[in-house]
């Protein structure tokens, strides 16, 4: 195709006449705004086809694109066409009129678009503004096309000055439909409710502006529909929430609630489900076992823990020997009940630096208007053993006795042992265990007493040695669950002048 004048851009005078010619090897035609204006078509003797477009009495409205194309390109291998852009500077025409379609620009993704405000004069300075603001936006301008760039979801106008007159274009509206892959989250105010209470569920989608929510729920299957409410969360762009509210729940409302969300722009969808349980009345249930006998060590801190589930939230009280316990101001006792999940609770009693007086019968009671549960245990305070006395005596009978006295809780065990070879025992040789069954001629007598006020056992053990022929190191060891204590004494024969 050959076009004369070749362009690609021409500036013509207003009111003038201008002739455009296009020729080619097949029939050709001039097009303007997707239409064919009146033109003269001819075929020369050499087989060349031509079309002549005469533009008369030009005005600014003749500004724009002109195309020459093959009249019937079906038989041609190339869909060739030539473009020419003509400006007709005309002070009476500000911005060229737009089709309505050009004023409303719709997007579903971030992409470059053109705001097609065009003027008749390529020398004019054109600026782009948000409709609300005066500041010119730094967007490149092409006199043949307009402003091209990535635009926010805003309304825009173009401005230019013709002579001393400022001219505004129509407003252009950019609508961006926010779409992305769908990620649904569903939650309930409560997943357990009593009959007669309300069920309220929320389904939230982020990052999408246009979605459809569809709920499926037990009541729907029986044909009893509930109308959900959809709203847009304030201060959170593109957070859409659908709320399903079922007042006065029935037992039959127990089951799976599913929120299905679809977005038709890119055909995305996602769904999430949640289980709701409607109970006839409230409940309190203990979880796990707590032994009826619990232990704490004297002067150490001890936390006693009870795990239970309940609905509705219960009141929790602790008692010691039938007297109500509370957080002590001295910080010796701390009570706490915490919600570890919607219906699961952990109640803890912490005794700080346990004292003997804190032994006793403890009860935790959890209750509400529908149900109650209680759990009791005995708390025993364990006291490490102490050897309080180890003494040796020589009764007239000729035998020698060693007396060991100690205390502790639980009841201490007593172990007697001896070392004959004082140089090597107990480092190199183990001590010999003593008692009624040992090879020495010795007898053992042990008495145990429980002291109620101190809540501990006292052990008194007497070792009788029949004859001692050389110095002997006698050791008394007391042991219980929380410790051991040892003392030793040297026993010498009667014949020796010293002890």
């Amino acid at each position: 195709l050959v076009v004369t004048p070749p362009g690609p851009e021409l500036v013509l005078n207003v009111s003038s006449t201008f002739v455009l010619t296009c020729s080619g090897s097949a029939p050709v035609v001039w097009e303007r705004m997707s239409q064919e204006p009146p033109q003269e078509m001819a075929k020369a003797q050499d087989g060349t086809f031509s079309s002549v477009l005469t533009l008369t009495n030009l005005t600014g409205l003749d500004t724009g694109e002109y195309f020459c194309t093959h009249n019937d390109s079906r038989g041609l291998e190339t869909d060739e066409r030539k473009r020419l852009y003509i400006f007709v500077p005309d002070p009476t025409v500000g911005f060229l009129p737009n089709d309505a379609e050009e004023l409303f620009i719709f997007l579903t993704e971030i992409t470059e678009i053109t705001i097609p405000c065009r003027v008749t004069d390529p020398q004019l300075v054109v600026t782009l503004h948000e409709k609300k603001g005066d500041v010119a936006l730094p967007v490149p301008y092409d006199h043949q096309r307009g402003f091209s760039g990535i635009f926010e979801d805003r309304s825009y106008i173009c401005k230019t000055t013709i002579g001393d007159r400022e001219v505004d274009s129509d407003a252009y509206y950019v609508y961006r439909l926010q779409v992305s892959s769908i990620n649904v989250s569903v939650n309930a105010v409560q997943t357990v409710v009593r009959q007669g209470e309300n069920i309220t569920l929320m389904c939230i989608v982020i990052g999408n502006e246009v979605v459809n929510f569809e709920w499926t729920y037990p009541r729907k299957e029986s044909g009893r529909l509930v109308e959900p409410v959809t709203d847009f969360l304030l201060d959170m762009p593109y957070h859409i929430r659908s709320i399903l509210h079922i007042p006065s729940a029935e037992l039959e409302d127990s089951g799976t609630y599913t929120c299905n969300v679809t977005e038709s722009v890119n055909d995305h969808q996602d769904e999430k489900a949640i289980n709701i349980t409607v109970v006839e009345s409230g409940y309190v249930r203990l979880l796990g076992e707590v032994g009826t006998l619990q232990f704490a060590e004297l002067h150490r801190s001890r936390t006693l823990q009870v795990v239970f589930e309940a609905y509705p939230p219960p009141t929790v009280l602790w008692f010691k020997d039938n007297r109500t316990l509370g957080d002590s101001s001295a910080g010796e006792i701390a009570l706490s009940t915490r919600n570890v999940s919607e219906t699961r609770y952990v109640s803890e009693l912490t005794l700080v630096r346990v004292k003997v007086a804190e032994a006793g019968h403890y009860t935790m009671r959890a209750f509400h208007e529908d149900a109650e549960v209680q759990l009791s245990f005995q708390l025993q305070i364990n006291v490490p053993v102490r050897v309080l006395e180890l003494s040796e005596s020589h009764p007239d009978s000729g035998e020698q006795t060693v007396r060991c006295r100690g205390r502790g809780m639980p009841q201490p065990n007593i172990i007697w042992s001896a070392c004959r070879d004082l140089k090597r025992c107990p480092r190199e040789l183990p001590p010999t265990l003593l008692g009624n069954s040992s090879e020495e001629e010795s007898q053992l007598e042990t008495n145990v007493t429980y002291w109620e006020e101190e809540q501990e056992f006292e052990v008194v053990s007497t070792l009788r040695l029949q004859h001692v022929d050389r110095p002997l190191s006698v050791r008394c060891t007391l042991r219980n669950a929380v410790g051991q204590d040892t003392q030793e004494v040297i026993v010498v024969p009667h014949s020796l002048p010293f002890k």
Epitope: K132, D153, Y175, L177, E209
Partner: nanobody, 116 residues
Framework: QVQLVQSGAEVKKPGASVKVSCKAS????????MSWVRQAPGQGLEWMGW????????KYAQKFQDRVTLTTDTSTSTAYLELRSLRSDDTAVYYC?????????WGQGTLVTVSS
């Protein structure tokens, strides 16, 4: 908050008409115009027309000029799209959208299925 709530899905026979509503809340209805856009399966968004809620002035895309009527009811803050002489290629999701100047707001879409 601005919210546009559209009427439910419609199934129509070829040659029939459909009227889709779009109820606005959260802003002064007459202060903004309402655009209508549609998206046919597998296609992009196609602008159909715009109506000024203030004075009822309309702009239509040339393609729909003869078959579309846009109206508003300011007493209920509702905009309507009526499409006549339905054809199977009118099967699409129809959206209303308004522009608040600093961002646009969209209805949730209404699926119109045209099938014999």
């Amino acid at each position: 908050q601005v919210q546009l709530v559209q009427s439910g899905a419609e199934v129509k026979k070829p040659g029939a008409s459909v009227k889709v509503s779009c109820k606005a809340s959260g802003y002064t209805f007459i202060s903004h115009g309402m655009s209508w856009v549609r998206q046919a399966p597998g296609q992009g968004l196609e602008w159909m027309g715009w109506i000024s809620a203030d004075n009822g002035n309309t702009k239509y895309a040339q393609k729909f000029q003869d078959r579309v009527t846009l109206t508003t009811d300011t007493s209920t803050s509702t905009a309507y799209l009526e499409l006549r002489s339905l054809r199977s290629d009118d099967t699409a999701v129809y959206y209303c959208a308004t522009h608040g100047g600093d961002r646009s707001y969209w209805g949730q879409g209404t699926l119109v299925t045209v099938s014999s």
